[in-house]
Amino acid sequence: GKGDPKKPRGKMSSYAFFVQTCREEHKKKHPDASVNFSEFSKKCSERWKTMSAKEKGKFEDMAKADKARYEREMKTYIPPKGETKKKFKDPNAPKRPPSAFFLFCSEYRPKIKGEHPGLSIGDVAKKLGEMWNNTAADDKQPYEKKAAKLKEKYEKDIAAYRAKGKPDAAKKGVVKAEKSKKKKEEEEDEEDEEDEEEEEDEEDEEEEEDDDDE
């Protein structure tokens, strides 16, 4: 779990190793100087972009080695009791629709990343949040309309998907169906939350990969 101290440290990207090296170099040169993080990130990003494939190779090797370490450690890692593997997700199940904010982020993330290349994923997300909060309700409307349409489509698709998956459900009694409805809805809410987290994780991973490509 998130709080498990025994859980192997996450694998680092080549760019992360490069930034770490930059930090160490900076500390050696200026041991007492405080670091302006956004300036430092920007400089790192600019340096990374101008580096040759050969120069990046060293960091890529470090990332490969760290990936191997992570995979090796994960094989022997036993999660704490009660922390079970996520339930199986049917790849054919309709994908949960994005929220209005998620759609908005897809529009404006390139702008923020383009204008502030050194920003971390967290800072990009923070800036997007600020932009969304400062956007007038009517400027949010197109995203909200699209999200509502996608939600409607998802609800139809998921109903069809469930009906297809349980052809004998109709034969069961109405009373039993009503009883289980509330429990089912609670389960669905949990699933939805998991899906949302997963989508965010996937996006973060994609962004890390983008950083690697820079």
Epitope: K111, E115, N134, A136, A137, D138, Y143, K146
Partner: antibody, heavy 119, light 108 residues
Framework: EVQLLESGGGLVQPGGSLRLSCAAS????????MTWVRQAPGKGLEWVSS????????IYADSAKGRFTISRDNSKNTLYLQMNSLRAEDTAVYYC????????????WGQGTLVTVSS | DIQMTQSPGTLSLSPGERATLSCRAS???????VAWYQHKPGQAPRLLIH???TRATGIPVRFSGSGSGTDFTLTIATLEPEDFAVYYC?????????FGQGTKLEIK
């Protein structure tokens, strides 16, 4: 330097069509929400339509709904306004403008192109 | 739709004087969504103020915006010859995004 250059205006008969273009330069076009604003002779400014950075989201004034279509080609750094079923009251100078951040207020404008609807 | 009414329609002043332009909204607005523009004949409109009081990039400090609710003001502290133009207020809190009819600032 940010530049917006409108073209495609001219004289058209009522019921006719016209396609306005706005060529953008000096900034990363695909990052910005863009808009069309018009000014009828002797009148004030009137917002017409706006489009999101990717072109996936559009919004129109009631006077433009169903007749005008805003679009963009990010590979060509160009904004468009397709105007159909034109009426005399559509006669105006049409400006394209760039939205600052995500708000519907505009920090850079073109010089405008005149559309005259008359028989 | 939110109507924006500007007053006066025309303001005749001399360079060096202070100009106060008013804008009234037909319903209460958050100042966050009010902008002011300057427009000269044959030129592109120019954004002066957004968010009610934030000066746009490159706008001289003599221009300032204030107000809340339904009443908003653009003040030009000391008029320069190049400031004579038409000024528009705009609300962008709800669509349609509406402008005032404009205030013409002319040389006395």
């Amino acid at each position: 330097e940010v530049q917006l250059l409108e073209s495609g205006g001219g004289l058209v008969q009522p019921g006719g069509s016209l396609r306005l273009s706005c060529a953008a330069s000096g900034f990363t076009f695909s990052y910005y929400m863009m808009t069309w604003v018009r000014q009828a002779p002797g009148k004030g400014l009137e917002w017409v339509s706006s489009i999101s950075p990717s072109g996936g989201y559009t919004i129109y004034a009631d006077s433009a709904k169903g007749r005008f279509t805003i679009s963009r080609d990010n590979s060509k750094n160009t904004l468009y306004l397709q105007m159909n079923s034109l009426r005399a009251e559509d006669t105006a100078v049409y400006y394209c403008a760039r939205a600052l951040s995500t708000g519907s207020f505009w920090d850079y404008w073109g010089q405008g192109t005149l559309v005259t609807v008359s028989s | 739709d939110i109507q924006m009414t500007q007053s006066p329609g025309t303001l005749s002043l001399s360079p060096g004087e202070r100009a106060t332009l008013s804008c009234r909204a037909s319903e209460s607005l958050t100042s966050t969504y009010v902008a002011w523009y300057q427009h000269k004949p044959g030129q592109a409109p120019r954004l002066l103020i957004h968010g009610g009081s934030t000066r746009a990039t490159g706008i001289p400090v003599r221009f300032s915006g204030s107000g809340s609710g339904t009443d908003f003001t653009l003040t030009i502290a000391t008029l320069e010859p190049e400031d004579f133009a038409v000024y528009y207020c705009q609300q962008y809190g709800s669509s349609p995004y509406t402008f005032g009819q404009g205030t013409k600032l002319e040389i006395k």
